[in-house]
């Protein structure tokens, strides 16, 4: 999916109002220095591509993020403010139901969410630069 035509202001507002709080809650008990940020993004569409990938694509050591509250809110935000995104999720949603996994917060998941926080902050910064 090409995130070029999204309403970035609306996405930023949703992130600042609610998604950021859920990400921070997930990370509670860990320090920001516990993990190094290894994933970056260069512009707003690129940041959203990386955020989508890290939030919804299961990895061998962290398969459960898509069911978290911040992930559900991220999905809703992209579906609402990115033209045509919801259509791309119809088959993806059905596939995700089939591979539902037990929720476990592993250190690898905490690291992945730390990367997500970094990507979202980068997304906000690129937005501010444009303004």
């Amino acid at each position: 999916y090409d995130f070029t035509n999204c309403d970035f202001q609306k996405i930023e507002a949703d992130y600042l109002r609610t998604i950021s709080k859920d990400l921070i809650t997930y990370m509670s008990g860990t320090k920001s220095t516990d993990f190094n940020n290894t994933v970056s993004c260069s512009n707003r569409p690129h940041c959203l591509t990386e955020i989508q990938s890290l939030t919804f694509n299961p990895t061998p050591r962290c398969a459960s993020l898509a069911k978290e509250m911040f992930a559900r809110k991220t999905k809703a935000t992209l579906a609402l403010w990115c033209p045509g995104y919801s259509e791309t999720q119809i088959n993806a949603t059905q596939a995700m139901k089939k591979r539902r996994k037990r929720k476990v917060t592993t250190n690898k998941c905490l690291e992945q969410v730390s990367q997500l926080l970094g990507l979202w902050r980068r997304f906000i910064r690129t937005l501010l630069k444009k303004q």
Epitope: A13, R17, A76, E87, T93
Partner: antibody, heavy 120, light 107 residues
Framework: QVQLVQSGPEVKKPGSSVKVSCKAS????????MHWVRQRPGQDLEWMGT????????DYNQNFKGRATITADKSTSTAYMELSSLRSEDTAVYYC?????????????WGQGTLVTVSS | EIVLTQSPGTLSLSPGERATLSCRAS??????VHWYQQKPGEAPRLLIY???QSISGIPDRFSGSGSGTDFTLTISRLESEDFAVYYC?????????FGRGTKVEIK
């Protein structure tokens, strides 16, 4: 089963406000946005706006911006649409309709409609 | 905003005949089009979503096709309860919009 039950008919004077409610049951309220659509007598459907409980945000059709306010009470699974500065052209049936925001993404259940008549 | 143009405005057919309803978008909207049926005094009822996805409980004589700007709702064999107004709606981007409807009436 999924049900959206709207408040009863209203007769209002021009310049006044009306608040229509939509009580949802049979599903998880925060998994769906609540849209409001109106239909003037003998006319087509017109999207007014939506409230997304999961994100605590709303969006409006520019035609209604400033006059329509869409809210929700998550504790009672009830959505509200308030329309102010009413004029005779606002005489219409007002519908609420749910739309999945993390799946389905379509208005798959509708309220029965609320007739609002604006007359002096 | 995206404008949806439905044609024809009215379709006069007999039970058992095939109905073909058209919906054209003013810009590319991929497959983000949904079809609703509305009878007098009732709320709209969802028939088809995302151009061609069927809904459980809706008879399989209703089918949808199309992508980009041109969409079609087909009713393979009209039954007496199918005479109603049909609307297309886009959810590609805000503000969501509806077509002006096609009335399917008994000939």
């Amino acid at each position: 089963q999924v049900q959206l039950v709207q408040s009863g008919p209203e007769v209002k004077k021009p310049g006044s406000s009306v608040k229509v409610s939509c009580k949802a049951s049979g599903y998880i309220f925060t998994d769906y946005a609540m849209h409001w659509v109106r239909q003037r007598p003998g006319q087509d459907l017109e999207w007014m706006g939506t409230f997304i409980p999961l994100l605590d945000t709303s969006d409006y059709n520019q035609n209604f911006k400033g006059r329509a306010t869409i809210t929700a009470d998550k504790s009672t699974s009830t959505a509200y649409m308030e329309l102010s500065s009413l004029r005779s052209e606002d005489t219409a049936v007002y519908y609420c309709a749910r739309m999945g925001v993390t799946h389905s993404y379509v208005m798959d259940a509708w309220g029965q409609g609320t007739l609002v008549t604006v007359s002096s | 905003e995206i404008v949806l143009t439905q044609s024809p405005g009215t379709l006069s057919l007999s039970p058992g005949e095939r109905a073909t309803l058209s919906c054209r978008a003013s810009q590319h909207i991929s497959r983000s089009v949904h079809w609703y049926q509305q009878k007098p005094g009732e709320a709209p009822r969802l028939l088809i979503y995302f151009a061609s996805q069927s809904i459980s409980g809706i008879p399989d004589r209703f089918s949808g096709s199309g992508s980009g700007t041109d969409f079609t709702l087909t009713i393979s064999r009209l039954e007496s309860e199918d005479f109603a107004v049909y609307y297309c709606q886009q959810s590609y981007s805000f503000p969501y919009t509806f077509g002006r409807g096609t009335k399917v009436e008994i000939k």
